[in-house]
């Protein structure tokens, strides 16, 4: 199975009904605290604002946030850890009318209320300590 | 210039006079807080103890520590940040009789007192959010 480059960056337009699907594997054992980060950006530039920031410290915690006009806002933290040490994961982020719903291996694991309209998203970046085998954005058929 | 795989792992034996030299570049702008981590392990396994843990959160801080019998000990933190956003860096870690001396781009930037003998090191791992172009361990000629 061929690997996608990491950091992986792709242009994306999101709206209610869209789903971002990511398949990958941590590059280190959980004892060493590898990270996974998914950022929904407002521009194609990596220094642009972040509508939805999702960061997993494997084996430890997940933090979610937004970066608005260059400043991080109120962080949301979860100790829920459905990821398995050394195992491949499938992550899907669905755009619901009022929030993002994050599924891990088919199990609803995290939610994050919209602070900025999902329509403001222009780019998704997946990065940090993972190998990436799949990235897909599915759009709701109008 | 060809890139080394990251995480990069190499067997190593260290003693007073040894120097570990690393050349690389952060994979993201400092605003996004990419990391660099260098770990001196007691075994070839990544879950082994860590004699010297050196972690840079680019643009923010450096933390140094040891992991002994699976437990992290007293963390040493520095706000000194000689790394440049978007620029290649050369990092050299020299084994002095009583401590590690970390040079960044030829400038002495950090020190870490030996907690465990450097002779206990069997492997060095370089990882997280960097591209790596050089890794070298030089040994003192007896």
């Amino acid at each position: 199975m061929s690997l996608l480059p990491v950091p992986y960056t792709e242009a994306a337009s999101l709206s209610t009904g869209s789903t971002v699907t990511i398949k990958g594997r941590p590059l280190a054992c959980f004892l060493n605290e590898p990270y996974l980060q998914v950022d929904f950006h407002t521009e194609m530039k990596e220094e642009s604002d972040i509508v939805f920031h999702f960061q997993v410290c494997f084996g430890r915690r997940v933090v979610m946030n937004s970066r608005e006009y260059g400043a991080w806002k109120q962080q949301v933290e979860s100790k829920n850890m459905p990821f398995q040490d050394g195992q491949e994961f499938e992550l899907s982020i669905s755009v619901l009318p009022d929030k993002y719903q994050v599924m891990v291996n088919g199990q609803s694991s995290y939610t994050f209320d919209h602070r900025i309209k999902p329509e403001a998203v222009k780019m998704v970046q997946v990065w940090r300590d993972i190998s990436l085998t799949k990235f897909n954005v599915s759009y709701l058929k109008r | 210039m060809s890139l080394l795989p990251v995480p990069y792992t190499e067997a190593a034996s260290l003693s007073t006079g040894s120097t570990v030299t690393i050349k690389g570049r952060p994979l993201a702008c400092f605003l996004n807080e990419p990391y660099l981590q260098v770990d001196f392990h007691t075994e070839m396994k990544e879950e082994s103890d860590i004699v010297f843990h050196f972690q840079v959160c680019f643009g923010r801080r450096v933390v140094m520590n040891s992991r002994e019998y699976g437990a992290w000990k007293q963390q040493v933190e520095s706000k000194n940040m000689p790394f440049q956003d978007g620029q290649e860096f050369e990092l050299s870690i020299s084994v002095l009789p009583d401590k590690y001396q970390v040079m960044v781009n030829g400038q002495s930037s950090y020190t870490f007192d030996h907690r465990i003998k450097p002779e206990a090191v069997k492997m060095v791992q370089v990882w997280r959010d960097i591209s790596l172009t050089k890794f070298n361990v030089s040994y003192l000629k007896r």
């Epitope: - | 007293q74 009583d98 465990i116």
Partner: antibody, heavy 120, light 107 residues
Framework: QVQLVESGPGLVKPSQTLSLTCTVS??????????WSWIRQPPGKGLEWMGA???????YYSPSLKSRTSISRDTSKNQFTLHLSSVTPEDTAVYYC????????????WGQGTLVTVSS | NFMLTQPSAVSVSLGQTARITCQGA??????GIWYQQKPGQAPVQVIY???NRPSGIPERFSGSSSGGTATLTISGAQAEDEADYYC??????????FGGGTHLTVL
């Protein structure tokens, strides 16, 4: 030249709490990389490390004494204090305070020691 | 629990070489340290970091470490070297441990 001086009661009753203070002169207990320890030596026996407080205020204790030991500090007086609860006659010893510069080096400066007897 | 084992007593003739050993599983990982203690006095470091001598300690004192054994050597022992000697290392870098002590007699 750093100097350490222990002070406290020479006699403590069983089940009470022993408290000893170490006053440091010639150097600050908050100086980076220094660790301030308590060591004891029962009469005619060997040395036993009890615990330490770091320059940062972090504390470390001997696993065998952890449940009964606490170490605190008063930076304004440049002092650190050992508290040992629920003492028994087996806690009778000369108690030393000492300084350790870092992991590589030894306990390089010691107090003269103070004898504490636990007896009713 | 990590332990450091020393002989309880060692004797040496005046001017001869005395060797005091300290055995412990962690001595391959952590540094060995040696203290001299004379009656009624606080201990004084004579060796740190396996083999380093603090200033003021005579050159006849030396230290070495190999595997799980640290050794204190006194070359040309003097009468004033008669004392108790304690080795110290670490269970982990935040938990110092002492050996049981060795009484050195200079004959």
């Amino acid at each position: 030249q750093v100097q350490l001086v222990e002070s406290g009661p020479g006699l403590v009753k069983p089940s009470q709490t022993l408290s000893l203070t170490c006053t440091v002169s010639g150097g600050s207990i908050t100086t980076n990389s220094y660790y301030w320890s308590w060591i004891r030596q029962p009469p005619g026996k060997g040395l036993e490390w009890m615990g330490a407080i770091a320059y940062s205020g972090s504390t470390y204790y001997s696993p065998s004494l952890k449940s009964r030991t606490s170490i605190s500090r008063d930076t304004s007086k440049n002092q650190f204090t050992l508290h040992l609860s629920s003492v028994t006659p087996e806690d009778t010893a000369v108690y030393y305070c000492a300084r350790r510069p870092n992991w590589y080096r030894a306990l390089d400066a010691w107090g003269q020691g103070t004898l504490v007897t636990v007896s009713s | 629990n990590f332990m450091l084992t020393q002989p309880s007593a060692v004797s040496v003739s005046l001017g001869q070489t005395a060797r005091i050993t300290c055995q412990g599983a962690n001595l391959g990982r952590y540094y060995g340290i040696w203290y001299q203690q004379k009656p009624g006095q606080a201990p004084v470091q004579v060796i740190y970091g396996d083999s380093n001598r603090p200033s003021g300690i005579p050159e006849r004192f030396s230290g070495s470490s190999s595997g799980g054994t640290a050794t204190l050597t006194i070359s040309g022992a003097q009468a004033e070297d008669e004392a108790d000697y304690y080795c110290q290392s670490y269970e982990s870098s935040t938990s110092p441990v002492f050996g049981g002590g060795t009484h050195l007699t200079v004959l």
